[in-house]
């Protein structure tokens, strides 16, 4: 607890102090006072620097004195032998004695009293910026007129802060301008404009005179502009050293004018105004800005349109243009959006064709579709070359965005048929000679594949079984072979409307319009052993003449067995219809005259006993295309005959082309279109 006075005596005083003693006293007087410490008696063993025994006086970290020996007063009217005056309110006194004393020493007696200090004069650092007033136990600071005392109660300044300027134009000056500005002041001015406007400050060089910088280049008095995280300044000196036009890029500006205690000048004056916030004319590649202006400011709206072949991708949606607004922060809205090259994406695959993986799928890239040759060709032309167009589609010069269509090549066997020996009187054949050949297992018969979805056969083959099981691609009809071949599943059977359905088909004598189509559930994949035969054209070129040769194939009856295990084939000439009429029916089910012969029938055979027979029905009578010798077309279908090994009758396919085309068109699937 601080006291105003006190007494300090060495141990055992006034008796001799003991050896080996160390004792300290902490003196504390109230704050605002100093300490006057004085000794009235001093009798301590003398040694050099008071090394043996001593009394030490310490103020803070400073030793105020160290005493030893004997002292007596110089003034007969005063008992004081030694005294100390400190301007602080704390003091420490330490007494030390060593292990021996050659004589008897009585120690010391000392007293302290609290004394007033003059804070205004007693310290190197002046406590007040302007006027200092001392009183017992303290001091107070005061200010000249028009100044006020800051919260620290020491510094005076002028009341120059707190002004907020919101007008779009204005003028601000230092206090008293053009008279000298006040010392020791911090003036803060705030300019706050509405968002979207930037503060632009303009000064004239001659309107600025602020105490110059020191030798190190530090401004003693300074003017600073702060706009968000940007700072302009500090500025000082005679004549404004900074840019005379400061574009702050912000709607908020703080002006800070800081002065020290010395060197007042006339100060400064500035003007400010609010400019609509400019947005930079950004270079957005591959696009056009509308409207085009030299400068864009707050609230300006532009439409940015991508050049052809470029698009704005936002999420999953592509657009060709977007709007951007100059925002209050000087940035464009939608600035993340960019015009990127249109990406046409991975090209769609096509059935029975392929497209090479493109190096790029961006605007201008080129891809090429090809069909699986030699079994498919590109039906709808266009060459298969597509480029990535500006609208994001792969486009062909002829077809536009429509994909190429790979359709089976018809009538081209992988291996030509060669007669090895003289169906009846026929030769062994390979399915590659007749890749269109279809095998029906119930009844045992044949058919001709005419495209991916359709099989052509005789009406009498399917009239009793509307769900026939068919196979393609096998030379042998042994079970193990068929299990490895392609089984075809029918979707629907279409029998020609002119075919007369009978209660007892075995007694049939009229085979007119013996033609049917089987629509398949799934498309057939073409290859060396499976490939369609062409249909005849409608022109007179496809009218058969007597002697024209055609090929027949099948697993029907041969001389040796009821059913052939491996495919047989024969080359037959077309014969006049009367030749067929002249042959006696082998096992007639009616009068010979009852058998019907019509122009819808072709008569062929009669040479070297070569003929089709039971089990060959529905198979094609294939004739070389007169307009393309590499191809065969189905001129006829094995229909009936008077006697195996003589002449046979074949349905004249040319007469049914319209019906075939119409039936296929009316019953096609979207996949086929």
């Amino acid at each position: 607890e601080p006291t105003m006075y006190g007494e300090i005596l060495s141990p055992n005083y006034p008796q001799a102090y003991p050896s080996e003693v160390e004792k300290s006293w902490d003196i504390e007087v109230p704050e605002g006072y100093g300490i006057h410490l004085y000794f009235t008696h001093l009798d301590i063993e003398l040694s050099e620097n008071c090394a043996y025994d001593s009394v030490q006086i310490i103020s803070g970290d400073t030793e105020e004195g160290r005493l030893c020996g004997q002292r007596s007063s110089n003034n007969p009217h005063s008992p004081i032998v030694e005294e100390f005056q400190v301007p602080y309110n704390k003091l420490q006194v330490i007494f030390k004695s060593d292990f021996s004393n050659e004589e008897r020493f009585t120690g010391f007696a000392a007293y302290y009293v609290a004394t007033d200090i003059n804070e205004c004069t007693d310290f190197v650092d002046v406590p007040c910026s302007h006027f200092c007033n001392n009183f017992i136990g303290g001091y107070f600071c005061s200010c000249p007129p028009e100044y006020f005392l800051h919260d620290d109660m020491k510094n005076c300044g002028v009341n120059c802060s707190g002004d907020v300027f919101t007008a779009l134009i204005g003028e601000i000056a230092s206090p008293n301008y053009p008279k000298p500005y006040p010392e020791n002041s911090r003036c803060e001015y705030q300019i706050r404009l509405e968002k979207g406007f930037q503060v632009v400050v303009t000064l004239r060089r001659e309107d600025f005179d602020v105490e110059a910088a020191d030798s190190a280049g530090n401004c003693l008095d300074s003017l600073v502009f702060v706009a968000g995280d940007r700072q302009f300044g500090p500025y000082c000196g005679h004549g404004f050293p900074g840019p005379l036009n400061i574009e702050t890029k912000s709607n908020a500006l703080d002006i800070i004018f800081q002065t020290d205690l010395t060197g007042q000048k006339k100060g400064w004056k500035l003007r400010y105004h609010g400019d609509p916030m400019p947005c930079p004319k950004e270079d957005t590649p591959n696009s056009v800005w509308e409207p085009a202006k030299a400068k864009y400011v707050f609230r300006d709206v532009v439409q940015i349109t991508c050049l052809d072949g470029f698009e704005v991708v936002e999420g999953r949606v592509g657009a060709t243009s977007f709007y951007s607004t100059c925002q209050s922060n000087g940035k464009w809205s939608n600035s993340k959006l960019k015009c990127q090259p249109v990406d046409c994406g991975i090209p769609e695959s096509i059935e029975n064709g392929k497209v090479e993986d493109p190096e790029s799928t961006l605007f201008g890239s080129v891809i090429r579709y090809t069909c699986e040759e030699p079994y498919y060709y590109m039906e709808n032309g266009g060459g298969g070359e597509y480029h990535c167009a500006g609208n994001g589609s792969w486009v062909n010069e002829v077809l536009g965005p429509e994909l190429p269509k790979c359709v089976p090549v018809c009538g081209v066997p992988r291996e030509p048929f060669e007669e090895k020996q003289r169906i009846i009187g026929g030769s062994d054949a390979d399915i590659k000679n007749f890749p269109w050949q279809v095998f029906f297992d119930n009844p045992w018969a044949g058919g001709a594949l005419i495209n991916e979805y359709w099989v052509l056969t005789a009406a009498h083959v399917v009239e009793g079984n509307r769900e026939p099981t068919m196979y393609v691609g096998s030379t042998s009809v042994q079970t193990s072979r068929l299990a490895k071949s392609k089984m075809l599943t029918p979707e629907h059977v279409f029998i020609h409307p002119g075919w007369k359905l009978l209660e007892v088909p075995e007694g049939r004598t009229n085979f007119d319009n013996d033609i049917a189509l089987v629509r398949l559930k799934d498309p057939v994949k073409m290859g060396p052993t499976v490939s369609p035969i062409c249909l005849p054209g409608t022109s007179s070129d496809y009218n058969l003449m007597d002697g024209d040769l055609g090929l027949i194939s099948g697993w029907g009856r041969t001389e040796k067995r009821d059913r052939a295990v491996r495919l047989k084939a024969a080359r037959l000439p077309v014969a006049p219809l009367r030749k067929c009429k002249e042959v006696k029916v082998e096992k007639p089910t009616a009068d010979a005259e009852a058998y019907v012969f019509t122009p819808n029938m072709i008569c062929a055979g009669g040479e070297k006993g070569m003929d089709s027979c039971k089990g060959d029905s529905g198979g094609a009578f294939a004739v070389q295309d007169p307009n393309d010798k590499t191809k065969f077309y189905a001129a006829g279908l094995v229909s009936w005959g008077p006697q195996c090994g003589t002449y046979g009758l074949y349905t004249r396919v040319k007469n049914y082309v319209d019906w075939i085309m119409k039936t296929m068109q009316e019953n096609s699937t979207p996949r086929e279109d």
Partner: antibody
Framework: QVQLVQSGAEVKKPGASVKVSCKVS????????MHWVRQAPGKGLEWMGT????????IYAQKFQGRVTMTEDTSTDTAYMELSSLRSEDTAVYYC????????????WGQGTLVTVSS | DIQMTQSPSTLSASVGDRVTITCRAS??????LAWYQQKPGKAPKLLIY???SLESGVPSRFSGSGSGTEFTLTISSLQPDDFATYYC?????????FGQGTKVEIK
């Protein structure tokens, strides 16, 4: 109708070989695919293999690979099946069977040949 | 090789009963499955081929169904001549394999 006539019953010692013949009549061997099937006494049917004329190769069941050989003599329309390194579990009736057409697995069966393996 | 599993191994039934035998393939065999009937000392006789096609001369009380891996032979009304052992056989690809057989005996 195809007829298949097999050779007579055989008794063999373990480690020996047996060769069973199968004579075709009513058709030619070249037009047929001959299979061999066996049946141990009181047990099920076991397919052994076949000659595939289309591929021109003989296909054997994995179980018999390396022990069985199937051959054909087209001049006499006779098929043969030889099984070597006989063991007691090879005691069975061995059938030659012609492959069917158009989905029928087997057409005609031989009468069977009993091969007994006993020491 | 494709494994064929027949069930049951033995089946006791009476004349006039409806009997069903099942056959399961270890992988898909499409419809390439046949059913045989075998009597002691005789060669097997083909009843059904291609899963559901009835061999000519076989009574219509026999029927087959299924495709892929699950197949069934049904005898709609068991006759005295039908007591025998029945085998299924796959012929989708070599090796051709048989089921272990189902013996249909008199109850």
């Amino acid at each position: 109708q195809v007829q298949l006539v097999q050779s007579g019953a055989e008794v063999k010692k373990p480690g020996a070989s047996v060769k069973v013949s199968c004579k075709v009549s009513g058709d030619t061997l070249t037009e047929l695919s001959m299979h061999w099937v066996r049946q141990a006494p009181g047990k099920g049917l076991e397919w052994m293999g076949t000659f595939d004329p289309e591929e021109g190769e003989t296909i054997y069941a994995q179980k018999f690979q390396g022990r069985v050989t199937m051959t054909e003599d087209t001049s006499t329309d006779t098929a043969y099946m030889e099984l070597s390194s006989l063991r007691s579990e090879d005691t069975a009736v061995y059938y030659c069977v012609t492959e069917g057409l158009a989905g029928r697995p087997f057409d005609s069966w031989g009468q069977g040949t009993l091969v007994t393996v006993s020491s | 090789d494709i494994q064929m599993t027949q069930s049951p191994s033995t089946l006791s039934a009476s004349v006039g009963d409806r009997v069903t035998i099942t056959c399961r393939a270890s992988q898909s065999i499409s419809s390439w499955l046949a059913w045989y009937q075998q009597k002691p000392g005789k060669a097997p006789k083909l009843l059904i081929y291609k899963a559901s096609s009835l061999e000519s001369g076989v009574p219509s009380r026999f029927s087959g169904s299924g495709s892929g891996t699950e197949f069934t032979l049904t005898i709609s009304s068991l006759q005295p001549d039908d007591f025998a052992t029945y085998y299924c056989q796959q012929y989708n690809s070599y090796s051709w394999t048989f089921g272990q057989g189902t013996k249909v005996e008199i109850k």
